[in-house]
Interface confidence: low
């Protein structure tokens, strides 16, 4: 467990043209926050995605009006850290979203408004215990100045905060199998404490905070035995001893919601469902009214005057979730066949079809030939959304309305001249030369060269050519 | 060629049910959005609704709780079916084609069959 | 989605260069088309995706914008151009028409 820490030193105009105008004015006097989200590993999800490692909200400014004719100064910001609590190990490497937000102060209807200024983004590698990082990132004309760290909580140590020291029972060694914690040699690694109500006789852990069960024993904390009467569960590998399914740690096995949350099982983790008041990937932010600004993506703060009532987000189309944290991404069901573009609305689902594909969701191969005739004896051959004639001989162009010269290929060889013929071509060959395209030299003694010329016909007489 | 041709009743008491039929001649019946779109006299367009020849419908939610399309693909056939009407739903009704996967261009109309609702 | 359509009429002569403007009330990429309707007529198909000339449509006519922000233009007005024109937005449903322009004779 840890702290990822940020310190935002400056938000306003990059360097070079174009200064952006300030976002306050004497008529909407406004006042800066901003947000931080952290996902593990060097992930390019989209920003909505959920902030697995955590989220944090930054209190409000100073209040900020421009004067009338200056350029956007650096804009006054809030005191202290951005704090986000991590309960699990530090991954070292962690993807983050830094978001500017302005909230306008001006006679809004309904409260405050709030509208996102900038949004940065970045992946870096860090490693816990380590000093300030500085950066500097632009969206667009702004500029963001800030600093970071991850800092391990006692009485956890390392770069990934995963091995736990306690100070020495004894001045002169530690416990049996414990080693002295570099680099705190007056301190000892504790043994690894699992979830809190592990079975010590049927669990076991390898990370702080798991419970990893013994065969035979199942539960969030392995107290359960594995039943061989019943096999029933829905989940989990074949137990070879009983021939069940024996039940595999689910997710939301022991409800990591707190708080009253809802657990939901994703193809790849969990996600809670918070009651109001509540928010964080475990539900574990509390005490939030609409003065901290809880409503993500636009969405609009109602009630929750203090601590003790709820607040209600009013989510913008095309965001859910009790902060309006989630994008509804129905596209990542992939529901468009055929190559075809999907478009989430918000209110509907469109597919944008590739050429020949047609359908709302471009299920169909588009009847190419329909209502396409080929002309003189053609026959219509579909690909790819467009359609082609393959043409009788002596016909061409695309509906084989266009009477071929069968000649214009030159197809005559060695000086042969060409005639168009009804069925075809003829080709009249020089001395010399024979075949349908005169393409065989005729041989000195008089005799042709394979295949030969057929009874009847003299080398050089004109050979049709069928 | 493609040819849209309508028909249905032209004129209604309130509170009963519109119904309009349109053919579709010439070309595919499958790759489409088969489209009703109304005007009233001497006003602008609205747009009712759609259907896919595999039965997929959208709805004008101003419309949605009065509003049914259905399709017969056997007869290249498309229905509208609008309940409860007043004299407000007096219009031109229009049906037509709109293309996939480039805009619902509509790119083929029905002549138009004027509703009159009147008691 | 509304369709703001300007102006609602206009009347110019034959050779004048029209332009008409439709502006959405939120972001709608470049799902915009454009129709003629003449009296007792079904409208006729102009321009789709914003720019697109619509196959047997003239030249004269062209269509240009992207996001909120659209233009029909005639570049050269023909007595057959005395008409009624409407935009219409295909990016969500409901697709919606603009209230219209009616172009009359000067």
């Known amino acids: 467990a840890g702290v990822f820490e940020l310190q935002i030193h400056s938000f306003g105009p990059g360097p070079g043209p174009g200064a952006p105008r300030s976002p306050c004015s004497a008529r909407l006097p406004c006042r800066l926050f901003f947000r931080v989200c952290l996902k593990p590993g060097l992930s390019e999800e989209a920003a909505e995605s959920p902030c697995a490692l955590g989220a944090a909200l930054s209190a409000r400014g100073p209040v900020y009006t421009e004067q009338p004719g200056a350029p956007a100064p650096d804009l006054p910001l809030p005191d202290g850290l951005l704090q986000v609590p991590f309960r699990d190990a530090w991954p070292g490497t962690f993807s983050f979203i830094i978001e500017t937000w302005r909230e306008e102060l001006g006679d809004q209807i309904g409260g405050p408004a709030w509208s996102l200024l900038a949004r940065v983004a970045g992946r870096r590698r860090l490693a816990a215990g380590g000093p300030w990082a500085r950066d500097i990132q632009r969206a667009g004309a702004w500029e963001l100045r800030f600093s970071y760290r991850a800092r391990c909580e006692p009485p956890a140590v390392g770069t990934a905060c995963t091995r736990l020291c306690r100070p020495r029972s004894a001045p002169s060694r530690c416990g049996p199998g414990l080693r002295p914690c570099a680099p705190l040699e007056d301190e000892c690694e504790a043994p690894l404490v699992c979830r809190a109500g592990c079975s010590p006789e049927h669990g076991f852990c390898e990370q702080p905070g798991e419970c990893r069960c013994l065969e035979g024993w199942t539960g969030p904390l392995c107290t359960v035995p594995v039943s061989t009467s019943s096999c029933l569960s829905p989940r989990g590998p074949s137990s070879a001893t009983t021939g069940c399914l024996v039940p595999g740690p689910g997710p939301c096995d022991g409800n990591p919601c707190a708080n009253g949350g809802s657990c939901s099982e994703t193809p790849r983790s969990f996600e809670c469902t918070c009651p109001r008041g509540f928010y964080g990937l475990r539900c574990e932010v509390s005490g939030v009214t609409c003065a901290d600004g809880p409503c993500f993506n636009g969405g609009l703060c109602v009630g929750g005057a203090d601590p003790d009532s709820a607040y209600i987000c009013h989510c913008p189309p095309g965001f859910q979730g009790s902060n309006c944290e989630k994008r509804v991404d129905r596209c990542s069901l992939q529901p468009c066949r055929n190559g075809g573009l999907c478009l989430d609305l918000g209110h509907a689902l469109r597919c944008r079809c590739r050429a020949g594909f047609a359908g709302p969701r471009c299920e169909h191969d588009l009847d190419d030939c329909a209502g396409r005739a080929c002309a003189n004896g053609g026959t219509c051959v579909e690909g790819g959304g467009a359609h082609r004639c393959s043409c009788a001989l002596g016909f061409g162009g695309r509906d084989c309305r266009e009477r071929a010269d069968p000649c214009a290929a030159r197809p005559c060889a060695h000086g042969g001249r060409c005639y168009a013929h009804f069925s075809g071509l003829v080709c009249a060959c020089a001395p010399g030369y024979m075949g349908a395209r005169c393409e065989f030299p005729v041989h000195p003694d008089g005799a042709s060269a394979l295949p030969a010329a057929p009874p009847g016909l003299r080398p050089g007489d004109p050979q049709r050519y069928l | 060629q493609v040819q849209l041709q309508q028909w249905g009743a032209g004129l209604l008491k309130p509170s009963e049910t519109l119904s309009l039929t349109c053919a579709v001649y010439?070309?595919?019946?499958?790759?489409?959005?088969w489209t009703w779109i109304r005007q009233p006299p001497g006003k602008g367009l609205e747009w009712i609704g759609e259907?896919?020849?595999?039965?997929?419908?959208n709805y004008n939610p101003s419309l949605k709780s009065r509003v049914s399309i259905s399709v017969d693909t056997s007869k290249n056939q498309f229905s509208l079916k609008l309940s409860s009407v007043t004299a407000a739903d007096t219009a031109v009704y229009y049906c037509?084609?709109?293309?996939?996967?480039?805009?619902?261009?509509?790119?083929?109309w029905g002549q138009g069959t004027l509703v009159t609702v009147s008691s | 989605i509304q369709m703001t359509q300007s102006p609602s009429s206009l009347s110019a002569s034959v050779g004048d260069r029209v332009a008409i403007t439709c502006r959405a009330s939120?972001?709608?990429?470049?799902?915009l088309g454009w129709y003629q309707q003449k009296p007792g007529k079904a409208p006729k198909l102009l321009i789709y995706?914003?720019?697109s000339l619509q196959s047997g449509v003239p030249s004269r006519f062209s269509g240009s914008g992207s996001d909120t922000d659209f233009t029909l233009t005639i570049s050269s007005l023909q007595p057959e151009d005395f008409a009624t024109y409407y935009c219409?937005?295909?990016?969500?449903?409901?697709?919606?028409f603009g209230g219209g322009t009616k172009v009359e004779i000067k």
């Open positions: 037509a084609r709109g293309e996939y996967g480039s805009g619902s261009r509509f790119d083929y």
């Open positions: 010439g070309g595919s019946f499958s790759g489409y959005y």
């Open positions: 259907i896919t020849h595999s039965g997929s419908t």
């Open positions: 939120q972001g709608i990429r470049d799902d």
């Open positions: 995706a914003a720019s």
């Open positions: 219409l937005q295909d990016y969500d449903y409901p697709l919606t």
